[in-house]
């Protein structure tokens, strides 16, 4: 679809092309499996254009269909710790609030590896907060080329 000259001069946010790419800030305290994210040009190659961070969790500000992607690499990992010796380490991405829209969007297991990556298209609504839960005792890398999380608005 071609954009008019007036549309070309508008910022991307006003066109609905919301996008965010985040890097890992820290893991949660005991009993909190969530990963806490951060983004902004001062931090490197992470940014938010439309979506916002609420206490380290990503909140959507515009309805639409989004591509959600995530990669997590474990800094503390083991060929056995991802299977026999520990509870299975899994990563789940889901809508965690509002409670009425709570649902799992992505679920991945590390099995024998130390890196997982996935993406999917899914409808998201304004106010949806996405949580990324890492269950199991292993510790993710904060290297920005190993662990990252993002969303991209695709269409209404």
């Amino acid at each position: 679809q071609r954009l008019s000259r007036a549309q070309q001069q508008l910022p991307l946010e006003s066109l609905g092309w919301d996008i965010a790419e985040l890097q890992l800030n820290h893991t949660g305290p005991q009993q909190d499996p969530r990963l806490y994210w951060q983004g902004g040009p001062a931090l490197g190659r992470s940014f938010l254009r439309g979506p916002e961070l609420d206490k380290g969790q990503l909140r959507i500000r515009r309805d639409g269909i989004y591509m959600v992607h995530i990669q997590v690499t474990l800094a503390i990992c083991s060929s056995t710790s991802t299977s026999r010796h520990h509870h299975p380490t899994t990563l789940a991405v889901g809508i965690c609030s509002p409670a009425s829209r709570s649902i799992s969007l992505l679920r991945l297991s590390f099995h024998q590896g130390c890196t997982i990556a996935s993406q999917r298209l899914t409808p998201l609504a304004r106010g949806d907060t996405l949580c990324t839960n890492l269950t199991g005792t292993l510790l993710p890398s904060r290297n920005t080329d190993e662990t990252f999380f993002g969303v991209q608005w695709v269409r209404p």
């Epitope: 820290h26 893991t27 949660g28 305290p29 005991q30 009993q31 909190d32 800094a75 503390i76 990992c77 083991s78 060929s79 056995t80 710790s81 130390c114 005792t137 292993l138 510790l139 993710p140 890398s141 904060r142 290297n143 190993e146």
Partner: antibody, heavy 120, light 108 residues
């Protein structure tokens, strides 16, 4: 300047307990995973235990699992190692060590160590 | 558990000479997650190299690391008097994290 200062070492009876502390300064303590590493007299280095920056994840060597507990108090910038059911083979200098920011467990700063002697 | 074997146990060299220290792993080290440390008597270890070949902050460029898989090397291009110490390798790609038992570099 990053500083790590261990304390709490000393003489303990076999089967006894000790609690080691490591006071940290010069960096944002809560942002870094930490480990304890020990070295028996004239012997190799041995990793003992690690803990994430938030304290939510802990890791142990098989030789200490079930006997030692690692913890941290981020409000006090202090790392702990509670050592129970001590054995003669736990005799060593215990170092606290800071992980890299990435969380990877190579150790860019170490304390000077505290000596634990287990003997009757 | 990955066992690290360092060789030789002792290296007798003179200042200005080149030192080559070996660290061999019992199985492949994930992504070359191997570090080297220097330790002098009565002191804590000091990080020299991480990721098999990256020099830690403040480490002189006469120290270099190389290798991947199961075979790793620390090279000191020209030994200075302060380099005589014990050197340890450590793998951190797999739990539990393990150290070699060290190579002592002594003055000939």
């Amino acid at each position: 300047e990053v500083q790590l200062l261990e304390s709490g070492g000393g003489l303990a009876q076999p089967g006894g307990s000790l609690r080691l502390s490591c006071a940290a300064s010069g960096f944002t303590f809560s942002s870094y995973a930490m480990s304890w590493v020990r070295q028996a007299p004239g012997k190799c280095l041995e990793w003992v235990s690690a803990i994430s920056g938030s304290g939510g994840s802990t890791f142990y060597a098989e030789s200490v699992k079930g006997r030692f507990t690692i913890s941290r108090d981020n409000s006090k910038n202090t790392l702990y190692l509670q050592m129970n059911s001590l054995r003669a083979e736990d005799t060593a200098v215990y170092f606290c060590a800071k992980h890299d920011y990435s969380n990877y467990p190579y150790f860019d700063y170490w304390g000077q160590g505290t000596l634990v002697t287990v003997s009757s | 558990e990955i066992v690290l074997t360092q060789s030789p146990g002792t290296l007798s060299l003179s200042p200005g000479e080149r030192a080559t220290l070996s660290c061999r792993a019992s199985q492949s080290v994930r992504s070359s997650y191997l570090a080297w440390y220097q330790q002098k008597p009565g002191q804590a270890p000091r990080l020299l190299i991480y990721g098999a070949s990256s020099r830690a902050t403040g480490i002189p460029d006469r120290f270099s690391g190389s290798g991947s898989g199961t075979d790793f090397t620390l090279t000191i291009s020209r030994l200075e008097p302060e380099d005589f110490a014990v050197y340890y390798c450590q793998q951190y790609g797999d739990l539990p994290f393990t150290f070699g038992c060290g190579t002592k570099v002594e003055i000939k």
